[in-house]
């Protein structure tokens, strides 16, 4: 980047150009380059208390190049800016500042958020989730048969994780009560996949109750249609007491 730096080495009068090194067109013993060869940029480099003129093929980081008819000059970016395109447009801010449309800011505007990796004001990204996958087979202790009420679960994927200011993700797991099919379990039938059996539709007085998984965020939010009527619960208890047939289960 800082190719073809020129500085004189032999003692000579300030404005004499012969003997100038590298890209210098004119130079002085004390100030280094005073002007540059065509297409090169003139920049001042601080060395201790002294400022020395140098000629560069491109401007260093923290400076931008301007071409004038008589000279191509490197000019320092604004104090809060690390690299800039021109005097009005910063392309990378110094630590503690965030870039927004070419300017360095302490805080990002509303509707944008600060990205501490890129040090830019960026779009707020909200959570995005997929559609629900189908309900899993109805199981009770891993079994898909018997007279017991079990549970079934469904899941959905997070397509887009939210950024710091983005909306949180809704539940990605949901569980609800269901009725395991009314038949005796055959030997080795435990955990049979639901696609191999018909899922029993609930009786008139039995609604399925969906409960978001305890891991998920909005588990406390109750959906009205998922609430079970107290009378229906009592009715089922009575029905269950009347079933005196014992069911053999394989554990």
């Amino acid at each position: 980047q800082n190719a073809s730096r020129g500085r004189r080495q032999r003692r000579m009068h300030p404005n004499v150009s012969q003997g100038c090194q590298g890209g210098c067109a004119t130079c002085s013993d004390y100030n280094g380059c005073l002007s540059c060869k065509p297409r090169l940029f003139f920049a001042l480099e601080r060395i201790g208390m002294k400022q020395i003129g140098v000629c560069l093929s491109s401007c260093p980081s923290g400076y931008y190049g301007t071409r004038y008819p008589d000279i191509n000059k490197c000019t320092k970016c604004k104090a809060d800016c690390d690299t800039c395109f021109n005097k009005n447009f910063c392309t990378k801010c110094k630590s503690g500042f965030y870039l927004h449309l070419g300017k360095c800011l302490d805080n990002c505007p509303e509707g944008l958020e600060a990205n501490n990796h890129t040090m830019e004001c960026v779009s707020i990204v909200h959570c995005e989730v997929s559609e629900w996958n189908p309900w899993s087979p109805c199981t009770k202790k891993g079994k898909t048969c018997g007279f017991k009420r079990g549970t079934e679960t469904r899941v959905r994927e997070i397509i887009q994780h939210p950024s710091a200011k983005g909306n949180l993700c809704p539940p990605t797991n949901e569980t609800r009560k269901c009725t395991v099919q009314r038949k005796k379990c055959q030997k080795g039938e435990r955990g049979k996949k639901g696609r191999e059996r018909k899922r029993k539709k609930p009786n008139k007085g039995e609604s399925k109750e969906a409960i978001p998984d305890s891991k998920s965020l909005e588990s406390s939010k109750e959906i009205p249609e998922q609430r079970e009527n107290k009378q229906q619960q009592k009715k089922r208890k009575v029905q269950d007491k009347q079933k005196s047939v014992s069911v053999s289960t394989v554990h």
Partner: antibody, heavy 117, light 107 residues
């Protein structure tokens, strides 16, 4: 040099979706800042609709948030506007524009969309 | 949303005159304000950004000024090609709203 060109149907029926394409030449849509959609109503008022940024993230005008979607196809160097459930009030000239460091702001020529049955 | 109040909504001026259009914002836009010129049937063209920076290729007859909530666009020595509509737009908080426009006509 960089150029933007809008395209899409000039007539859309009420309650249907409006879909427009902005084709970009002379610059990659994965560079630059924000690739915008702006519309101008028959009375000349301008409305910023939203953008897709160089990294694919979006920002939309809250007044359109439930109906608008801006996506892109980086392989074709195009970005798209989809506006759902349109009404006669969405009749306008639609412009795509870009905010860049070098040029700061460049607009396409615009495409007129009429919403009518 | 930040409201943009542009004034006047229309004005008539003669070639060679100097005119000023103002844009007032409902809250500070921290100089993230641009001015556009639009001729009939054409797309808007950027004149000024960051409140006072002249866009590439724009005549020095145009100048932007202001800060906070008050901004203005001055046109020195009006030329025939300057007539048309002028709009301000802020690029601060989302959404980036436009002013209602100023129609500049030949007297």
């Amino acid at each position: 040099q960089i150029q933007l060109q809008e395209s899409g149907p000039g007539l859309v029926k009420p309650s249907e979706s409006l879909s427009l394409t902005c084709s970009v030449t002379g610059y990659s849509i994965t560079s630059g800042y924000y690739w915008n959609w702006i519309r101008q109503f028959p009375g000349n008022g301008l409305e910023w609709m939203g953008y897709i940024s160089y990294d694919g993230t979006n920002n939309y005008n809250p007044s359109l948030k439930d109906r608008i979607s801006i996506t892109r196809d980086t392989s074709k160097n195009q970005f798209f506007l989809k506006l759902n459930s349109v009404t006669a009030a969405d009749t306008a000239t639609y412009y795509c524009s870009v905010l860049l460091i070098q040029y700061f702001n460049i607009w396409g020529k615009g495409t007129t969309v009429t919403v009518s049955s | 949303d930040i409201q943009m109040t542009q004034s006047p909504s229309s004005l008539s001026a003669s070639v060679g005159e100097r005119v000023t259009i103002t844009c007032r914002t409902s809250e500070s836009v921290n100089n993230f304000l641009a001015w556009f010129h639009q001729k009939p049937g054409k797309s808007p063209k950027l004149l000024v950004y960051h409140a006072k920076t002249l866009a590439d290729g724009v005549s020095s007859r145009f100048s932007g000024s202001g800060s906070g909530t008050q901004y203005s666009l001055k046109i020195n020595s009006l030329q025939p090609e300057d007539f048309g509509n002028y709009y301000c737009q802020h690029f601060w908080s989302i959404p980036w709203t436009f002013g209602g426009g100023t129609k500049l006509e030949i007297k």
